[in-house]
Interface confidence: low
Amino acid sequence: SAPGEDEECGRVRDFVAKLANNTHQHVFDDLRGSVSLSWVGDSTGVILVLTTFHVPLVIMTFGQSKLYRSEDYGKNFKDITDLINNTFIRTEFGMAIGPENSGKVVLTAEVSGGSRGGRIFRSSDFAKNFVQTDLPFHPLTQMMYSPQNSDYLLALSTENGLWVSKNFGGKWEEIHKAVCLAKWGSDNTIFFTTYANGSCKADLGALELWRTSDLGKSFKTIGVKIYSFGLGGRFLFASVMADKDTTRRIHVSTDQGDTWSMAQLPSVGQEQFYSILAANDDMVFMHVDEPGDTGFGTIFTSDDRGIVYSKSLDRHLYTTTGGETDFTNVTSLRGVYITSVLSEDNSIQTMITFDQGGRWTHLRKPENSECDATAKNKNECSLHIHASYSISQKLNVPMAPLSEPNAVGIVIAHGSVGDAISVMVPDVYISDDGGYSWTKMLEGPHYYTILDSGGIIVAIEHSSRPINVIKFSTDEGQCWQTYTFTRDPIYFTGLASEPGARSMNISIWGFTESFLTSQWVSYTIDFKDILERNCEEKDYTIWLAHSTDPEDYEDGCILGYKEQFLRLRKSSVCQNGRDYVVTKQPSICLCSLEDFLCDFGYYRPENDSKCVEQPELKGHDLEFCLYGREEHLTTNGYRKIPGDKCQGGVNPVREVKDLKKKCTSNFLSPEKQNSKSN
């Protein structure tokens, strides 16, 4: 646990008056319908709110939308619908907000059936002004910004054309027809799949993967027999149909598709799927679905090339393609991930890894909680976290787990304490050390959010009744104050705070309902006067992440290094501030076997750090496919975990020899790949 403080709850002085002076109500002159909210830029305070209302008439549906803008974090809104000529905006495309602080916004309008193309409204000044542009096509997808240049946009049309704009949507050019899926890569590269015969669906497994690095002037076919493709970190993945049957395999490239290697992962059949759960520049978590309608599969973790994989977790819950998985990256502490497994008795249990998938364990039981009815032994049980799967099953879980990179160590989640996830009403639990230890934070389900980099946690009870009370904590959830933000309760629909958890403003969204009408309303509360002063050096304390044995000089070593953080003391009521930067000090560790994954053909028996040869591969040459050549692997069973920075200590040897034989990969080999220019 992070450094503890006095257990007694010190109340924040005069908070009611301070918050009352900083609570701003805005009633929207709208019938209820739906509302969507987007933040434009970082630390700009600009929010766009789009309300839409459908009036079903006898023959058709008449739609009306309104656009509102705030530039003070939601305290005040101005109706700017006239800037978009009172046009009805298509909510399924959302508001396409440009990357970083570009200030760019694209809204896609609804147009009448007979029009030649769609219509967009573009802003490049944080929605102060909009330009109407008629499109030469009907968009099928939201406009996608190039991550490198926000002037470059791509979109697919309803007729499967790939359209590109180089001047932020002013002028559009169709660069390819018969396109199924398109994605921006790095350096303004576009990857896309094309069909040759009938349609995307009909050609699934016979698609071609193309690349253009010059926005459509020239193209290169980088793969054939493609089922689908994906990008993760520096890896490009494609699932490719096998020659002889209906199975498919994952191929991976780290050079934008110039060369490919077959990933050492099981092939999958027609009803199965692969899913990239998480990826960074070092490695990938890949889920491989089990045959049959099991609802689970296996998580594998890759090496640094994305080629050799280690089994990380069995029976990983993942319902169907595009279905539900609870896999969660805990962004507040390096190396930590949480997910669910489906046990033999079909109960669902939560597992956590602190070392990027090397080992998974159950979550420690919170000290202030009892084991529930699911526990066979009332003294021994674990915390189980509700995430996407529970939400999809309509359990009383309003929110997925929450963590923020700049609120170091903090994880908030709904959960139950027992042998498995319970269908009973969950409580809210908090960890202040990245998931090692947990405490019950709030009784019953709540919405929650983190403000001021962890300096404040805000929560609202999840209730079917109207609400008018918000709870807040200045000590990482140990003690809570309640504040009545309005006399007249509202039907609550959501909490909104600026992404990144640096803000001190929270917006409570809901609607009021009277006999005649219902209206959208928002209350924005600024907590700046609760945290009266800026935090000083004395308000922070040193905390060693991943510490489990303070006695050990190697304590806290994860992936070959440890990190000491400056953490805000729980007892300090002060502002981290918008410019707060996490202060951390890394130090390198000696290598141990824990810093190595088991190599291809090896596995780790449970509770053992040594890698042993897989019985079925004993005595066989280990051969695998690399860049279209067969390789011979001489190994003593270990390979360094991607991203591991350890030095010295144990050093298992690994050697790869080129067998100079071709692999039977279904990809075009690099020398046969064709290029063409427009």
């Epitope: 303070p550 006695e551 050990d552 000089y553 000090q585």
Partner: antibody
Framework: EVQLVESGGGLVQPGGSLRLSCAAS????????MSWVRQAPGKGLEWVAT????????YYPDILKGRFTISRDNAKNSLYLQMNSGRAEDTAVYYC??????????WGQGTLVTVSS | DIQMTQSPSSLSASVGDRVTITCRVS??????LAWYQQKPGKSPKLLVY???NIADGVPSRFSGSGSGTDYTLTISSLQPEDFATYYC??????????FGQGTKLEIK
């Protein structure tokens, strides 16, 4: 007030052994790592050994491994350095230092070890 | 092992002068560096830890700066009691935690 007092220094024959002690007071001894550092006459500081707070983990530079042994007795608030197979180049003032991790924040006054025939 | 290069090895200065001592390290040590002062016949005294943090009881004229591989100890206005030898030491990762060879600061 934090105090570290070394003792046990003196003259030792080449090949001989010596055991240095360091008595700690004024702080909670059993939660701190401790180190020995030496300084040959007219030379700079050289790190000799470190031991973790409970005595489980010990660290030495490669050139001293096998000849020097650091240990501690938390019940007695004491730190020790066992020197074996003494060599002329081991002649130095030996300091014990409290070592919380990122620095050696308190040092003893030192004890002189002379290896000579 | 990490190599520490301290410079200059000796330096003459007068009371009131601003003095800078540098420590260059063979690889990035991420600010895991301490500075010590040692007077003749005395034990070393910690001045700065974690590259920039002044230890308790150390006068404010001492300051530490730097990151990566280059670190500096600065004395803003030299006092008579500051004439001594100064050492840097890294604490990057696991041992050996090497010291710099020292800088002897003498009266001009």
């Amino acid at each position: 007030e934090v105090q570290l007092v070394e003792s046990g220094g003196g003259l030792v024959q080449p090949g001989g052994s010596l055991r240095l002690s360091c008595a700690a007071s004024g702080f909670t001894f059993n939660i701190y790592g401790m180190s020995w550092v030496r300084q040959a006459p007219g030379k700079g500081l050289e790190w000799v050994a470190t031991i973790s707070s409970g005595g489980i983990y010990t660290y030495y530079p490669d050139i001293l491994k096998g000849r020097f042994t650091i240990s501690r007795d938390n019940a007695k608030n004491s730190l020790y350095l066992q020197m074996n197979s003494g060599r002329a180049e081991d002649t130095a003032v030996y300091y014990c230092a409290r070592h919380p991790g990122g620095a050696m924040d308190y040092w003893g006054q030192g004890t002189l070890v002379t290896v000579s025939s | 092992d990490i190599q520490m290069t301290q410079s200059p090895s000796s330096l003459s200065a007068s009371v009131g002068d601003r003095v800078t001592i540098t420590c260059r390290v063979s690889e990035n040590i991420y600010s895991n560096l301490a500075w010590y002062q040692q007077k003749p016949g005395k034990s070393p005294k910690l001045l700065v830890y974690a590259a920039t943090n002044i230890a308790d009881g150390v006068p404010s004229r001492f300051s530490g700066s730097g990151s990566g591989t280059d670190y500096t100890l600065t004395i803003s206005s030299l006092q008579p009691e500051d004439f001594a030898t100064y050492y840097c030491q890294h604490f990057w990762g696991t041992p050996p935690w090497t010291f710099g060879q020292g800088t002897k600061l003498e009266i001009k």
